[in-house]
Structures are given as structure tokens and as C-alpha cells.
């Protein structure tokens, strides 16, 4: 990996915090859309978990070179309903394929400014970033 | 909040890296066990995704005060098989409830040592940490 310049002003202990805190979730680059393809809407009998799932999904790369981690992946559901355990292909309308979201801690590289406002290396700013982790087969909500 | 010491030696730009890079996955505190409770092995019709799933799970806290994020959650499957979409309670042996793992980027706070070996604040060391995100209903692998 190439090294990032650090967060520090050039004299003494830094007055800047290493991490600037913000807990406002940052939206992902694209809305975590559903991505239904009847051709891929099937549960495989081998391969990785996301293809053997009865709520199969694919991963979409979200890369930001000024963020740690630079690469995040968003799950995209391949079917609106769950696939039948029996056939692995026909959909069962009694089950929905729903995205599981998570607010992940990420760090953004931001310029740090010294006391005179001059640019002094980089600071890391902590943010919560919403990612979709997987698609899960759930029973539909029954409203009370 | 009071500031915690940064990663920087006290003179000039740091010779220490802000982030020490290491991609050796760190195992979670406990093995991501299955946690079968017949009483909770059911798919609810309301509540959060992890209780409505036909592969329901609970979350277990993993806290480390010298890690960012300090709190991580490991999924623990509540059923060995998937729950029937029809009843929400009986298990269907044609489907397995499997843990979905992810190597998450975390940062550990480590002492930094100046040129003379004296302690100068903290550095952050990047590691990959294996977490179980969810339980997914999958078709069992068919061995070729």
C-alpha cells in the first residue's frame, strides 16, 4: 500500500484530533436498489453462500480512494421473493427477499489545517456509512 | 471530549505511519457458534429482519476498548435448518441456516515509539477482523 500522509501539524503534539467525529450516516453512492434478473433468480447447489441462498444476491463495488476501507461492497437482491427450497428456481410468494443493512464505521481522509490555516497533512474523519450486507428470506410483515 | 494523544512523534512530520497496515485476519473472541434454541427457532411476522428471517439469528456483542469500532456484533444462528415459510415454526430439512462471514476492516490502538524508543501517543494499526453478519437460508451443497 502507498502511505497516506499523517494527520499531524508539523510542530509539537497536534492540536487537531486524529479523528474528527461525525455520526451522520453517509448514503452509499447509489441507492441500494433491487436488481431482479429472472435468469439469475435461482438458488445454486454449489458455489458461494450468496448464490446458494434462497434469497440470492450479487455484490456491487463502491470504491472511494479517500475512504478507509477504500472498497466496500453492496449486496443487490436478484429476486423479489424467496426461491423454493424444493426446486431452487421457482419463487415462493410467501417469502420476501429483503436487504439487510448495516451502518459501517468508515474513515475519510480530509485535509488538516494548521493554526495559520495552512494545509498540514491529513486527518481521518469517522463516519457511519450505510451498506447492504446480504439478502435475507423473511416472512412478510403482518401489520397489527 | 478531551483529546487522546495522536500518533505523532513530537518533532516535524512523523516518521511513524499513521496507520500500520496488516491484513492478517484477527479471529473473533469466540468461535461464531451456532446457538440453537427451539423456543426461539421461529420466524416472526413482525420485528427486525433477524427475527423475521426463516434463518433467524441473534447478535452477540464483541467489545474491545482498544479497537475501532469498539463494538462489533456477531450473528448467532438460532436454527440449524430454515424455518418453513408456511408455519414460521417447523423446520425444513431441505434448507440449511448458514452463517455469512465478512472480514471487516478494524483499527487497533497501539503505542507508538519515538526515535529514542520513548512512548509518543498512539498509532492505529489496520487489521482484518472476521465477523459473522447474518444467517442465510441456503440449499445444501451437492458434492459433484
Amino acid at each position: 500500500y502507498s502511505h497516506w500522509p499523517s494527520c499531524c501539524p508539523s510542530k509539537g503534539y497536534p492540536s487537531e484530533e486524529l479523528l474528527r467525529w461525525s455520526t451522520v450516516p453517509v448514503p452509499p453512492l447509489k441507492p441500494a436498489s433491487l436488481d431482479f434478473h429472472s435468469v439469475s433468480c435461482r438458488a445454486s447447489e454449489d458455489g458461494p453462500l450468496n448464490s446458494r441462498a434462497i434469497s440470492p444476491w450479487r455484490y456491487e463495488l463502491d470504491r472511494d480512494l479517500n475512504r478507509l476501507p477504500q472498497d466496500l461492497y453492496h449486496a443487490r437482491c436478484l429476486c423479489p421473493h424467496c426461491v423454493s427450497l424444493q426446486t431452487g428456481s421457482h419463487m415462493d410468494p410467501r417469502g420476501n427477499s429483503e436487504l439487510l443493512y448495516h451502518n459501517q464505521t468508515v474513515f475519510y481522509r480530509r485535509p488538516c489545517h494548521g493554526k495559520k490555516g495552512n494545509h498540514k497533512g491529513y486527518c481521518l474523519e469517522r463516519r457511519l456509512y450505510r451498506v447492504s450486507l446480504a439478502c435475507v428470506c423473511v416472512r412478510p410483515r403482518v401489520m397489527g | 471530549y478531551s483529546h487522546w494523544p495522536s500518533c505523532c512523534p513530537s518533532k516535524g512530520y512523523p516518521s511513524e505511519e499513521l496507520l500500520r497496515w496488516s491484513t492478517v485476519p484477527v479471529p473473533p473472541l469466540k468461535p461464531a457458534s451456532l446457538d440453537f434454541h427451539s423456543v426461539s427457532c421461529r420466524a416472526s411476522e413482525d420485528g427486525p429482519l433477524n427475527s423475521r428471517a426463516i434463518s433467524p439469528w441473534r447478535y452477540e456483542l464483541d467489545r474491545d476498548l482498544n479497537r475501532l469500532p469498539q463494538d462489533l456484533y456477531h450473528a448467532r444462528c438460532l436454527c440449524p435448518h430454515c424455518v418453513s415459510l408456511q408455519t414460521g415454526s417447523h423446520m425444513d430439512p431441505r434448507g440449511n441456516s448458514e452463517l455469512l462471514y465478512h472480514n471487516q476492516t478494524v483499527f487497533y490502538r497501539r503505542p507508538c515509539h519515538g526515535k529514542k524508543g520513548n512512548h509518543k501517543g498512539y498509532c492505529l494499526e489496520r487489521r482484518l477482523y472476521r465477523v459473522s453478519l447474518a444467517c442465510v437460508c441456503v440449499r445444501p451443497r451437492v458434492m459433484g
Epitope: 479523528l19 467525529w21 | 487522546w4 441473534r58 447478535y59 456483542l61 469498539q70 463494538d71
Partner: antibody
Framework: QVQLVQSGAEVKKPGASVKVSCKAS????????MNWVRQAPGQGLEWMGL????????SYKQKFQGRVTMTVDKSISTAYMELSRLRSDDTAVYYC??????????????????WGQGTLVTVSS | DIQMTQSPSSLSASVGDRVTITCQAS??????LNWYQQKPGKAPKLLIY???TLHTGVPSRFSGSGSGTDYTFTISSLQPEDIATYYC?????????FGQGTKLEIK
């Protein structure tokens, strides 16, 4: 102001279950972890476990694993602690306690900063 | 689990005295230690977190210090309202553990 109000005293037979409630007010319920601590008559404090009301994530003391279940109802800002297969040595005052987090940021410190008034559970045949 | 050993288990002191309670952890807890006060029939109350930081509204006669495995809680000048049982608690690692308590009485 922050308040934790617990349910009333209970008398239970050995082998039964008890469910204690803890209603929170005066703060964002989902923003703070809730701990459960018990105290047998004339004894010290014993931590049982905690729950994050936001995602239902828990951590239980090994001793209580399989017997304790901590849950929340976010809609009414209430935490619950259910203890099953009760024995006479489970006779105790059960407390809920909010876990505050303090600086220095970003490495927080944790302490039980607000406590419920306690619920006496008596297990007797 | 981390064991916390508090001493003494009880002590008697006069108003105005300096009172010291110690707490020893079975392993290094990196200053991740809290102190609580519990009066008879009441719920515990947080006094000090992270070894030495006073919680909001706690009088300055209370203080804490220590590092590694050994920690100290001090009341610089004992007041009648300080009669209570005091507990240390580590939060270095789950499960959290408490000391067995020190019962403080007035002579």
C-alpha cells in the same frame, strides 16, 4: 431527566420464570446499552449481561447463558430481563442500569450512570 | 473472567478522616475502572469512571487513582452522608465484574 422505572416485586416458585421490566425516559433509548445487575440479600453486585436496544445485540455472563434472555420493546422504550428455571439462590434485587459512554473520543469509556430502583424477586417453594 | 479484590471489606472512620479503599484486578485493566456508592435500600450510584474522572455532580472530596492491576479510591474528608458501601467495577473486558464491596461506617 433520565429515569429508569422497574416493575414491582415478584414471588416465584423454583423452576418457574420471571420477567422484569425497565421503562426508560428522558433520553434516546436506542442510543445507550442497558445492563442488568443483581444483588442477593446482604451480598455484593453481580453483572448479568447487557443489551443494545438498537439492534438487540446482547452479551451475557457465562453463568446465566441459556437461562437469561434480555429483550427490548423500542416502541415503549422498555427493556426486559427474563430468568428461567429459577432456584432459591436467584432470590435477589435485580437492577437495570443504563450504560453511559464518555470521552476521550474516539475511544469511549463505559459506566453505568443511571440505575432503576430495583425489583425484588423472591424464589421460594 | 477478571477477578476484582477489594479491601478492606469494612472500615470504620470518623467525620473529617481521610478514607482509602483499594481494588486489585487479577490482570492489567488499563485504568478501565469505575467506582460506585450504594446506600442501604437504594440503587448504586456512579461516582468515578476511568479510574479518576468524577461523574457529574460528585463532590471533589472523592478521588481515584491507580494503574495496571492496583487502584485506590479516596475520600479526603469523610462526611456523614458518605456512609455507604463502595464498589469498584472493571470494564476492560466483558463480562464486567465488581469488587465484593467495602462497607464504610462512622465511628
Amino acid at each position: 431527566q433520565v429515569q429508569l422505572v422497574q416493575s414491582g416485586a415478584e414471588v416465584k416458585k423454583p423452576g418457574a420464570s420471571v420477567k422484569v421490566s425497565c421503562k426508560a425516559s428522558g433520553y434516546s433509548f436506542t442510543g445507550y446499552t442497558m445492563n442488568w445487575v443483581r444483588q442477593a440479600p446482604g451480598q455484593g453486585l453481580e453483572w448479568m449481561g447487557l443489551i443494545n436496544p438498537d439492534n438487540g445485540g446482547t452479551s451475557y455472563k457465562q453463568k446465566f447463558q441459556g437461562r437469561v434472555t434480555m429483550t427490548v420493546d423500542k416502541s415503549i422504550s422498555t427493556a426486559y430481563m427474563e430468568l428461567s428455571r429459577l432456584r432459591s439462590d436467584d432470590t435477589a434485587v435485580y437492577y437495570c442500569a443504563r450504560e453511559g459512554y464518555y470521552g476521550p473520543s474516539p475511544f469511549h469509556h463505559y459506566a453505568m450512570d443511571y440505575w432503576g430502583q430495583g425489583t425484588l424477586v423472591t424464589v421460594s417453594s | 473472567d477478571i477477578q476484582m479484590t477489594q479491601s478492606p471489606s469494612s472500615l470504620s472512620a470518623s467525620v473529617g478522616d481521610r478514607v482509602t479503599i483499594t481494588c486489585q484486578a487479577s490482570q492489567d485493566i488499563s485504568n478501565y475502572l469505575n467506582w460506585y456508592q450504594q446506600k442501604p435500600g437504594k440503587a448504586p450510584k456512579l461516582l468515578i469512571y476511568y479510574t479518576s474522572t468524577l461523574h457529574t455532580g460528585v463532590p471533589s472530596r472523592f478521588s481515584g487513582s491507580g494503574s495496571g492491576t492496583d487502584y485506590t479510591f479516596t475520600i479526603s474528608s469523610l462526611q456523614p452522608e458518605d456512609i455507604a458501601t463502595y464498589y469498584c467495577q472493571q470494564y476492560s473486558k466483558l463480562p464486567y465484574t465488581f469488587g465484593q464491596g467495602t462497607k464504610l461506617e462512622i465511628k
